[in-house]
């Protein structure tokens, strides 16, 4: 029997093909076989089908990187990594996506889901759209909605200072952050660490964080597959 999606455009389509184990998969932007991209799929969280695009877990990867690195992506998809703004922009241009953020620390966990998530193109400096919060972590991303991405060598924030430089990370900074998931791992100094303000504040660096996305209509697609 042929696959439902011979060239899956995201992890949800890979899952609908019958792949239910979390791990590395190849997806194809716009279903185009010439635009292959290796991604890590989370097939378990809240029904699965998520493309993980950020993971922090041990501090082994350096996240204090320049614009070029954040545009392209870096790290090991099985460990700590950033998928890349160019990839995020292309993926979210395929349709309507939702964002999920999973946070864990010393046995505690929290999550945030945003119904509508997109990253603009390079021309917009990868402008963030994030709306429709639900979850237990608190709505910290709302503050960053509408912001362009900033790195230490490309300052697009609204602060007097360079936020990426001040807080040794990169993000859709405003003035400066409520979320700093690309901050310095394990650094509990004010605003310097891996922060999600409305969960653990700015003086605590969270041990584990993942950001992931899947189509907003995934549940409908999943239900259709089960009925079929």
């Amino acid at each position: 029997i042929g696959l439902l999606y011979p060239f899956p455009r995201d992890c949800s389509q890979a899952m609908l093909n019958g792949d239910t184990t979390s791990g590395l998969y190849t997806i194809y932007i716009n279903g185009d076989k010439t635009q292959a991209l290796e991604v890590y799929c989370d097939m378990t969280s809240d029904g699965g089908g998520w493309i993980v695009f950020l993971r922090r877990k041990n501090g082994r990867e350096d996240f204090y990187r320049n614009w070029k690195a954040y545009a392209a992506g870096f790290g090991d998809r099985r460990e700590e990594f950033w998928l890349g703004l160019d990839n995020l922009s292309k993926i979210t241009a395929q349709g309507q996506y939702e964002l999920r953020v999973d946070l864990q620390d010393h046995g505690e966990s929290a999550y945030a889901v945003y119904d509508r998530f997109s990253v603009g193109d390079a021309k917009s400096r990868y402008k963030l759209k994030v709306e429709g919060y639900s979850g237990t972590a608190g709505d910290s991303m709302n503050y960053h909605n509408g912001r362009s991405f900033s790195t230490y060598d490309k300052d697009t924030d609204s602060a007097i200072t360079n936020c990426a430089l001040s807080y040794k990370g990169a993000f859709w900074y405003k003035n400066c952050h409520r979320v700093n998931l690309m901050g310095r791992y394990g650094d509990n100094n004010h605003s310097q660490g891996v922060n999600w303000f409305h969960w653990k504040g700015h003086e605590y660096s969270i041990q584990f964080a993942e950001m992931k996305l899947r189509p907003s209509n995934f549940r409908n697609l999943e239900g259709r597959r089960k009925r079929a």
């Epitope: 709505d139 709302n142 503050y143 909605n145 602060a159 200072t161 405003k174 003035n175």
Partner: antibody
């Protein structure tokens, strides 16, 4: 243009209730968190309460917690403040205010205020 | 709660002079600091947001600076219409708190 108009203020006895309203126009109301800020006669500004765009999250100053309830009706573009167990120290001009974007943000639009006087 | 301390409380100043108002937060607030102007009988008006960003329509003689705990509002050359009370506000965390105000009046 963007506008906020408060109403519902008046003279009320201690222990009684009052409901303030704020009618919004000129912007997509449910996209923005809204707040109430008050100013006692001759005094400074005091933040009272805030509510998220969806109405799902609410916040209160300690001085009003348990007595005041903030709510909104996005279909009517309206914000409300239900004030129960009123005290003399609640006497103030009450302003509703719109945030620039997120919940904890600057207040870029303010109403003209509605006066609440609590006295026997 | 974060306490905001403004100084001075009153500032008699001649027209044309430079005005500097300071605001200090009781804890680190990054740049989550806003400035408002209020004239008698009127609602407050946003001047500066995020410590240094001029609100649309506000004259360029107003400027803001600072980060962390110490912030400044500057009026480069005081105009007659600038006589008012100025408030700082932290929007770092709930409850959002205001300074006690600085009244700028005619000297």
């Amino acid at each position: 243009q963007v506008q906020l108009v408060e109403s519902g203020g008046g003279l009320v006895q201690p222990g009684r209730s009052l409901r303030l309203s704020c009618a919004a126009s000129g912007f997509t109301f449910d996209d923005y968190a809204m707040h109430w800020v008050r100013q006692a006669p001759g005094k400074g500004l005091e933040w009272v309460s805030g509510i998220s765009g969806s109405g799902g999250s609410t916040y209160y100053a300690d001085s009003v917690k348990g007595r005041f309830t903030i709510s909104r009706d996005n279909a009517k573009n309206s914000l409300y403040l239900q004030m129960n167990s009123l005290r003399a120290e609640d006497t103030a001009l009450y302003y509703c205010a719109k945030v620039m974007s997120s919940m904890e943000d600057a207040f870029d639009i303010w109403g003209q205020g509605t006066m609440v006087t609590v006295s026997s | 709660d974060i306490q905001m301390t403004q100084s001075p409380a009153s500032l008699p100043t001649p027209v044309g002079d430079r005005v500097t108002i300071t605001c200090r937060a009781s804890q680190y607030i990054q740049g989550f600091l806003n400035w408002y102007q209020q004239k008698p009988g009127k609602a407050p008006k946003l001047l500066i947001y995020d410590a240094s960003n001029l609100e649309t329509g506000v004259p360029s003689r107003f400027s803001g600076s600072g980060s962390g705990t110490d912030f400044t509002l500057t009026i480069s050359s005081l105009q007659p219409e600038d006589f008012a009370t100025y408030y700082c506000q932290q929007s770092y965390s709930t409850p959002q708190t205001f300074g006690q105000g600085t009244k700028v009046d005619i000297k």
